[in-house]
Interface confidence: low
């Protein structure tokens, strides 16, 4: 399977709501031994392997983040932790995933990645993740209300225990 | 700050059982599976299992099965491990320990370990 | 089970000097997946251990770059390029590639 980030950038005004996403594709296996971990994280350019570092999201780590189901399942972050910093990961039945952050301020801006972790048993990983950039803006070229940018290639790299 | 606070010390007699927690804070619980360690005189490590505190699927050390069983309890964000038909080769300080990336077998955060003592 | 066996069992060092630690697996460290799941551990008296190095050479958060890990397949290294008084303690490295997960016996890091 891959991960896919239909949008690259996400340009918002301070105080909006965004959703970032991500969408897994290809062949799902659905056999009761195999169970997916989604979470998210942020990150920093530059590096040998984007992605490679994770920092966390308004002070929540990928593992406060992570969504732990079946493939193509629905879930969502239902801790008071997650919401009450003004975040929520969510997943639905056609592998789309993605995490709500409210109220943004310019300290929200930069590298997010989501990851996924496809787990058989003990621990035989498969795992790719994508990247996308959030720019906060504030002042009077702020836009009013987010505009997104498409992925040049939809397929985000395809990385293997990353 | 991550934590995870075990129970106090226990003495025990041969032949009984005993229930040892961990209670995680900090983090999301169910993000990582709990591991269990038994250290012997301060030196060697053994890894006695684990347990997805999502599904609260368990692996076992097969050397540890029938004598470790391990549980969790979710609403408190609390894992536990019970020892049973303990003899005196159970005396030692029992740690658990957080999987760093959910189930890969490497330990970002311990507890400070439960010391068992079993004695007549 | 994967028998993990670590040399020597005491290293006398001077302070600022550099350390080595070996350890050896029974059998091929490398998983199916391609990763190999070697960690480190350093466990000072009176505490819990804790992680320095996962996954052979990657050296866990907060740790300082004078420890490195390195090896392949059944042989491994940790070094410490200048050792401080904060590094004394006990080494453990650990295998988590093949169920049980396994130890080596430990390596004693003390003051020459």
């Known amino acids: 399977f891959k991960v896919a980030t239909p949008y690259s950038l996400y340009v918002c005004p301070e105080g909006q709501n965004v959703t970032l996403t991500c969408r897994l594709l290809g062949p799902v296996d659905k056999g009761h031994d195999v169970t997916f971990y989604k979470t998210w994280y942020r990150s920093s350019r530059g590096e040998v392997q984007t992605c490679s570092e994770r920092r966390p999201i308004r002070n929540l780590t990928f593992q406060d983040l992570h969504l732990h189901h079946g493939g193509h399942q629905a879930a969502n972050t239902s801790h008071d932790l997650a919401q009450r910093h003004g975040l929520e990961s969510a997943s639905d039945h056609h592998g789309n995933f993605s995490i709500t952050m409210r109220n943004l301020t310019l300290l929200d801006s930069g590298l997010y990645c989501c990851l996924v972790v496809e787990i058989r048993h003990h621990h035989s990983e498969h795992r790719v993740h994508g990247a996308m950039e959030l720019q906060v803006q504030t002042g009077k070229d702020a836009p009013s209300n987010c505009v997104v940018y498409p992925s040049s290639s939809q397929d985000s790299e395809n990385i293997t225990a990353a | 700050e991550v934590q995870l606070q075990q129970s106090g010390p226990e003495l025990e007699k041969p032949g009984a059982s005993v229930k040892i927690s961990c209670k995680a804070s900090?983090?999301?619980?169910?993000?990582?599976?709990m591991n269990w360690v038994k250290q012997n005189n301060g030196k060697s490590l053994e890894w006695i299992g684990n347990?997805?505190?999502?599904?609260?699927?368990?692996t076992y050390n097969q050397k540890f099965k029938g004598k470790a069983t391990l549980t969790v309890d979710k609403s408190s964000s609390t894992a536990y491990m019970q020892l049973k038909s303990l003899t005196s080769e159970d005396s030692a300080v029992y740690y658990c320990?957080?999987?760093?990336?959910?189930?890969?077998?490497?330990?970002?955060?311990w507890g400070a370990g439960t010391t068992v003592t079993v004695s007549s | 089970d994967v028998v993990m066996t670590q040399t020597p069992l005491s290293l006398p060092v001077s302070l600022g000097d550099q350390a080595s630690i070996s350890c050896r697996s029974s059998?091929?460290?490398?998983?199916?997946?391609?990763?190999?799941?070697l960690h480190w551990y350093l466990q000072k008296p009176g505490q819990s251990p804790k992680l320095l190095i996962y996954?052979?050479?990657n050296r866990f958060s907060g740790v300082p770059d004078r420890f490195s890990g390195s090896g392949s397949g059944t042989d491994f290294t940790l070094k410490i390029s200048r050792v401080e008084a904060e590094d004394l303690g006990v080494y453990f490295c650990?295998?988590?590639?093949?169920?049980?997960?396994?130890f080596g016996g430990g390596t004693k890091l003390e003051i020459k």
């Open positions: 900090g983090y999301s619980f169910t993000g990582s599976n």
């Open positions: 347990i997805d505190p999502y599904y609260g699927y368990t």
């Open positions: 650990s295998q988590s590639t093949h169920v049980p997960y396994t």
């Open positions: 059998q091929s460290l490398v998983h199916s997946n391609g990763n190999t799941y």
């Open positions: 320990a957080r999987d760093y990336d959910y189930a890969l077998g490497y330990f970002d955060v």
């Open positions: 996954k052979v050479s």
